[in-house]
Interface confidence: low
């Protein structure tokens, strides 16, 4: 067969859809691989062809577009299932071609089952709400294009297994779910079920997302360095191990990068000719405030090392802070016999 630009299996787009629900899947070629859209390709005389490989099979086969009630159909660059079946799971390929040009990409489609409480192996998107921040909304995701704007669907919202009715601070408003004041107790999985008619049939779209209540920007502060501090002195003799923890608290900030690093004599440890190791651990509070600890370790410290400046730095979107550790060389304990002898004026 003639050469075709094969983009391979696009595992980045692991598409999951629920069994017995409509699914519309756009050919990824136009979204991620080619620099033109379907309309341009179509008007240039290119044809979009779909085929698939069933789960646990190697054989590529055409998609059957002649099923009863047009269960599977193609519309422009979209492959439609009305509805999906469990055995639709497999790798799907869309190929764009004419006599001189060919480009194709495959992607995995997994049809998953859900129980009556909407539990399933589906990977859930996470939506973060600020704690005690005033009205915030989540929107029923990925329902565009399933029905025309003239169709008015019914939308039912659930928290876990329970229909959201008469909840204190959570109000369904059509496609939106409003949180009057988000609290930790609002953490959980929220499901919208969109029901709409089409050609005498009724279809359901189920969309579940995880709500995570996080720290509010109203309460956000610059990083706080708990250690090193002015109360602890790292007093060591040459040859001992020097361990200095840098522990920093970061307020939750959406899309913020939290960074902690050490400098030794104003340089990054990598740029200093001493054998230093740094180990990091991270923990999170219930509202995703973060505590990072970086432990600076010098196995066998020298008297030169004990004269250096050790500074812990931290930064987030709220600012940058730094704190120096108090490091000093331990004064050797007096040798008792010599001291005593000297005290008695012995020669």
């Amino acid at each position: 067969s003639e050469r075709c630009d094969d983009w391979g299996l696009d595992t980045m787009r692991q598409i999951q859809v629920f069994e017995d629900e409509p699914a519309r899947i756009k050919c990824p070629l136009f979204e991620h691989f080619l620099k033109f859209n379907y309309s341009t390709a179509h008007s240039a005389g290119l044809t979009l062809i779909w085929y698939w490989t069933r789960q646990d099979r190697d054989l590529e086969e055409p998609i059957n577009f002649r099923l009863p009630e047009n269960r599977i159909s193609k519309e422009k660059d979209v492959l439609w299932f009305r509805p999906t079946l469990l055995n639709d799971t497999g790798n799907y390929t869309c190929m764009l071609r004419n006599t001189t040009y060919c480009s194709k990409v495959a992607f995995p489609l997994e049809v998953v089952q859900k129980d009556s409480c909407f539990n399933s192996p589906m990977k859930l998107p996470v939506h973060k709400l600020y704690i005690e921040y005033g009205i915030q909304r989540i929107t029923c995701p990925n329902v565009d294009g399933y029905f025309p704007s003239s169709v008015k669907p019914t939308i039912t919202w659930y928290m876990g297994c329970y229909k959201i009715q008469n909840f204190n601070n959570v109000i369904p408003e059509g496609m939106n779910l409003s949180f009057l004041i988000a609290l930790i107790s609002n953490n959980g999985n929220y499901t919208c079920v969109v029901t709409y008619p089409e050609n005498g049939r009724t279809f359901h779209l189920t969309r579940t997302l995880t709500v995570k209540v996080v720290g509010s920007p109203k309460n956000a502060v610059p990083p706080v360095i708990h250690s090193p501090n002015d109360h602890v002195v790292y007093e060591k003799e040459p040859g001992e191990e020097l361990l200095i923890p840098c522990t920093v608290y970061f307020s939750f900030l959406m899309d913020s990068r939290n960074e902690v690093w050490w400098t030794i004599d104003g340089k990054k440890p990598d740029d200093i000719t001493i054998d230093v190791t740094i180990n990091e651990s991270i923990s999170h509070s219930r509202t995703e405030d973060e505590t990072r600890t970086q432990i600076l370790s010098i196995k066998k410290v020298t008297s030169e090392d004990l004269k250096r400046s050790y500074v812990c730095h931290a930064r987030s979107a709220k600012g940058e802070v730094a704190k120096a550790a108090k490091v000093k060389q331990k004064v050797p304990a007096p040798r008792y016999t010599v001291e005593l002898a000297c005290g008695f004026g012995a020669t």
């Epitope: 920007p217 956000a220 959406m254 913020s256 930064r315 979107a317 940058e320």
Partner: antibody, heavy 123, light 112 residues
């Protein structure tokens, strides 16, 4: 959509003071730094300072310490700049400008600007 | 404080040609990943408008004929092809570290 609406032109006497306002809409006011920028006629741009509405934290250009005071009223989503002991050197257009918030390391760009307030200091 | 030096002070180019504006910082405004350098366009009687942030990120809605490059201390704004509506003064701006933020002196773009 994001809008920054500034107060109208001001004509004041030397030695007096003035308070310029900048009303924000279309975004969560308290989560973005608000900056003030000065531009004298035919001249370039000069950063005056910035304020973080959620905490009231301020930073000033050293040249404007004691000259400008930045405040906010979070109930009305309004930022203010109070200028004192005015001289002809303070005659300029003053802009408020928001910094895009979601980049760490203090690398904030001024992504939305008010239309500017013209201040004329003259006897 | 970081000083930004823009050049040239003014620039006249033919329509459809390339305009190149340079901005040099007195010290580095880059860290691993990106640079805290931004470019603005100011037309007569209007407030400045953000064109490019972090040296090369085109702001939403800005035509692709504008592009930015550079890191460390040396940065470039390119406009190609220049159109009549691009007549304006262009400013670079750094926002490195704890403010003090500064602007370049500006470059006035005219059409020949």
């Amino acid at each position: 959509h994001v809008q920054l609406q500034q107060s109208g032109p001001e004509l004041v006497r030397p030695g007096a003071s003035v308070k310029l306002s900048c009303k924000a809409s279309g975004y969560i006011f308290i989560t973005y730094w608000m900056n003030w920028v000065k531009q004298r006629p035919g001249q370039g741009l000069e950063w005056v300072g910035q304020i973080f509405p959620a905490s009231g934290t301020t930073y000033y250009n050293e040249l404007f310490e004691g000259k400008a005071t930045l405040t906010v009223d979070t109930s009305s989503n309004t930022a203010y700049m109070h200028l004192t002991s005015l001289t002809s050197e303070d005659s300029a257009v003053y802009y408020c400008a928001r910094t895009d918030f979601y980049r760490y390391d203090g690398g904030y760009a001024l992504d939305y600007w008010g239309q500017g307030t013209s201040l004329t200091v003259s006897s | 404080d970081i000083v930004l030096t823009q050049s040239p002070i003014s620039l006249a180019v033919f329509l459809g040609q390339r305009a190149t504006i340079s901005c040099r910082a007195s010290q580095s405004v880059s860290t691993s990943g990106y640079s805290s350098m931004h470019w603005y366009q100011q037309k007569a009687g209007q407030p400045p408008k953000l064109l490019i942030k972090y040296a090369s990120d085109l702001e939403s809605g800005v035509p692709v004929r504008f592009s930015g490059s550079g890191s460390g201390t040396d940065f470039i704004l390119n406009i190609h092809p220049v159109e009549v509506e691009d007549i304006a003064t262009y400013y670079c701006h750094h926002s490195w570290g704890i403010p003090m933020y500064t602007f370049g002196g500006g470059t006035k773009l005219e059409i020949k």
